[in-house]
């Protein structure tokens, strides 16, 4: 058993059945000794008397918030969460599996720049009694700050039968370096309680590897004098890092038809600008990359041809 | 540059740009390896890393170039040894057309034009990191590609920067 | 010396599960992946899935999923592999194997435990 | 899936001769500087044995009579001077995707 915050505690069980469960032993907060009764929730039935109360945890019906009381006063709560550990791994029913980049993964982070400013989100199917809390640091042994926002609800989705809940945290490196090679990794950590359960989930990344630019922005088209070909023009997004000299983009350019069957041309450049065949009924595209490091491209930039 | 004079900003800008293309070709971005293998205790941090005070950011560079330019030396010989060694000669073999190879001597092309015959820079040792099985082997060459490829990002920033803002 | 001891032949009814145990001793357990793999008889072999110790992550082939549970006791050094709901198709020779990292060949396996469903 | 096609199903092979298998991939098995595909021998009533790593790196305590080779899609296993106890069923193994498959095998006969 272990503190999560002031009167609340997590109780760790392994989870099969018949399993004996683990002794608890809750002390009331008072200076108090005699006289001292103990109930659970909402229920007026005495569990026991006494400063102390042993109870034995075994699931859910033994979690919850028990109250000493004492001629009718309430004395001190302990809140008892449960967390579940089923064949040696920790459960992770709140959170779902968003399976990309790989199975098991249930935090995604991205920064739009090395500012040390970034974004986790994760998706749950649950709508109610649900509570978050985030922590972050730079390193795990010697850790460095890192400042996380509160969690909130960021998106709802129907999914088939299903309604799915996005929440999303913004944090911040307190002492961020842009320029310097990271060597310890960003590790988030999300504490998730649904009802009476507790459940823990990480992710550790450099910020390096969450990278995805924002698109390039003002994307013009300049016709070329008696030519099909057109002048695309483009600027690096506002929030990317500067000076543009030092972190630098590369570029994607994309002349895609109407149909999605169309061959695609595709030109990569490092300029701002680019000379491309505009086709009737076409688009014209354009992703940003870090130059330098092969982290994630933005999402496209697009005009229509005409 | 030993003695404070300026690096050939363009050519190390070229160089070190092949640099970070020859990396990623040697260790693409994303293999199931690396979504099988992650949060592992084997770690690389005793690879020499540019850090924050190494002045190798955009005001670092215009107050004094050679601090910076000193730190990249030291890592670009660092792992050019380490891509000489058995860690990478030893089993399993690379392939015949690897990127190594080339990876290799453009290490040891920047690192001389950085510090041409007779100057010395002091240069980290290399720790004995060969590990006894191939697996073993084989990990330890992904994450020393992988730091590497984070080591020349950094690297090609500066001698973009540099050749954009501090070229004669 | 590294082994890979495997419970002993299981005949159960259809319908029915069963739980195959592989005790691994002379090795760092943690260190390698531990592989399941089926050979039904005069057959190749098929890839059940694996555990990677290394963040006790669990994967299955998808041909496998929902007959097969993979388990692991880290104190004993024990894998478990459980097949529920077990048809005629499931008589098989199932085999634990240690899986290297880095390139996941299977270097030393199990004698194997032979499994027979039928009434 | 990748699937691994081995050819011949069986091969007799005069003592000290050159034996040669074949297994060809359904895609590519490489990634960055290596071929993801191993291989393994089986005797009647044992498990498998590895013997080839990584498409052509001798396991350790394999004879060097073994050899493999290959590149991209097709792969070799040979085995020269072929010898008495080599009789065995030989299998190819993807790990470059996930599931991991095996060959269908090749039955070595030692005339």
């Known amino acids: 058993i272990w503190e999560l915050k002031k009167d609340v505690y997590v109780v760790e069980l392994d989870w099969y059945p018949d399993a004996p469960g683990e002794m608890v032993v809750l002390t009331c907060d008072t200076p108090e000794e005699d006289g001292i009764t103990w109930t659970l929730d909402q229920s007026s039935e005495v569990l026991g008397s006494g400063k102390t109360l042993t109870i034995q945890v075994k699931e859910f019906g033994d979690a919850g918030q028990y109250t000493c009381h004492k001629g009718g006063e309430v004395l001190s709560h302990s809140l008892l969460l449960l967390h579940k550990k089923e064949d040696g791994i920790w459960s992770t029913d709140i959170l779902k599996d968003q399976k990309e980049p790989k199975n098991k993964t249930f935090l995604r982070c991205e920064a739009k720049n090395y500012s040390g400013r970034f974004t986790c989100w994760w998706l749950t199917t649950i709508s109610t009694d649900l509570t978050f809390s985030v922590k972050s640091s730079r390193g795990s042994s010697d850790p460095q700050g890192v400042t996380c926002g509160a969690a909130t609800l960021s998106a709802e989705r129907v999914r088939g039968d299903n309604k799915e809940y996005e929440y999303s945290v913004e944090c911040q490196e307190d002492s961020a370096c842009p320029a310097a090679e990271e060597s310890l990794p960003i590790e988030v950590m999300v504490d998730a309680v649904h009802k009476l359960k507790y459940e823990n989930y990480t992710s550790s990344f450099f910020i390096r590897d969450i990278i995805k630019p924002d698109p390039p922005k003002n994307l013009q088209l300049k016709p070329l004098k008696n030519s099909r070909q057109v002048e695309v023009s483009w600027e690096y997004p506002d929030t990317w890092s500067t000076p543009h000299s030092y972190f630098s983009l590369t570029f994607c350019v994309q002349v895609q038809g109407k149909s999605k069957r169309e061959k695609k041309d595709r030109v990569f450049t490092d300029k701002t600008s680019a000379t491309v065949i505009c086709r009737k009924n076409a688009s014209i595209s354009v992703r940003a990359q870090d130059r330098y490091y092969s982290s994630s491209w933005s999402e496209w930039a697009s005009v229509p041809c005409s | 540059v030993p003695g404070g004079s300026s690096p050939a900003w363009t050519q190390c800008q070229q160089l070190s740009q092949k640099l970070c293309t020859l990396a990623w070709s040697a260790h693409p971005l994303v293999g199931h390896m690396d979504l099988r293998e992650e949060g592992d205790e084997e770690t690389t941090n005793d690879v020499p890393h540019i850090q924050c005070g190494d002045g190798c950011d955009p005001q670092g560079l215009r107050d004094n170039s050679q601090f910076c330019l000193q730190r990249i030396h030291q890592g670009l010989i660092f792992y050019e040894k380490l891509l000489g060694s058995d860690i990478f000669t030893g089993e399993p073999s690379l392939l015949p057309d690897s990127p190594v190879g080339q990876l290799h001597a453009s290490l040891l092309g920047l690192s001389q034009l950085l510090q041409p015959e007779g100057h010395h820079w002091e240069t980290q040792q290399i720790p004995s990191l060969s590990p006894s099985q191939p697996w073993q082997r084989l990990l330890l060459r992904f994450k020393i590609l992988r730091s590497l490829q984070a080591f020349v990002a950094v690297a090609a920033r500066v001698f973009a920067h540099g050749a954009a803002t501090l070229s004669p | 010396e590294v082994q890979l001891q495997q419970s002993g032949p299981e005949l159960v009814k259809p319908g029915a599960s069963v739980k195959i145990s592989c005790k691994a001793s002379?090795?760092?357990?943690?260190?390698?992946?531990m592989n399941w793999v089926r050979q039904s008889h005069g057959e190749s072999l098929e890839w059940i899935g694996d555990?990677?110790?290394?963040?006790?992550?669990?994967t299955y082939n998808p041909k496998f999923k929902g007959k097969v549970t993979l388990t692991v006791e880290k104190s004993s050094t024990t894998a478990y592999m459980e097949l529920r709901s077990l048809s005629s198709e499931d008589s098989a020779v199932y085999y634990c194997?240690?899986?290297?990292?880095?390139?996941?060949?299977?270097?030393?396996w199990g004698q194997g435990t032979s499994v027979t469903v039928s009434s | 899936d990748i699937v691994l096609t081995q050819s011949p199903a069986s091969l007799a092979v005069s003592l000290g001769q050159r034996a040669t298998i074949s297994c060809r991939a359904s895609k590519s098995v490489r990634f960055s500087d290596y071929f993801y595909m191993h291989w393994y021998q089986q005797k009647p009533g044992q498990p498998p044995k590895l013997l080839i790593y990584?498409?052509?790196n001798l396991e350790s305590g394999v004879p060097a009579r073994f050899s493999g080779s290959g590149s991209g899609t097709d792969f070799t296993l040979n085995i020269h001077p072929v010898e008495e106890e080599d009789a065995a069923t030989y299998y190819c193994?993807?790990?470059?995707?996930?599931?991991?498959?095996f060959g269908g095998g090749t039955k070595l006969e030692i005339k």
């Open positions: 990584l498409a052509s």
């Open positions: 193994q993807n790990s470059r995707e996930l599931p991991y498959t």
């Open positions: 194997a240690r899986g290297l990292r880095g390139y996941y060949a299977m270097d030393y």
């Open positions: 555990f990677n110790h290394n963040n006790d992550v669990i």
């Open positions: 002379g090795y760092t357990f943690t260190d390698y992946y």
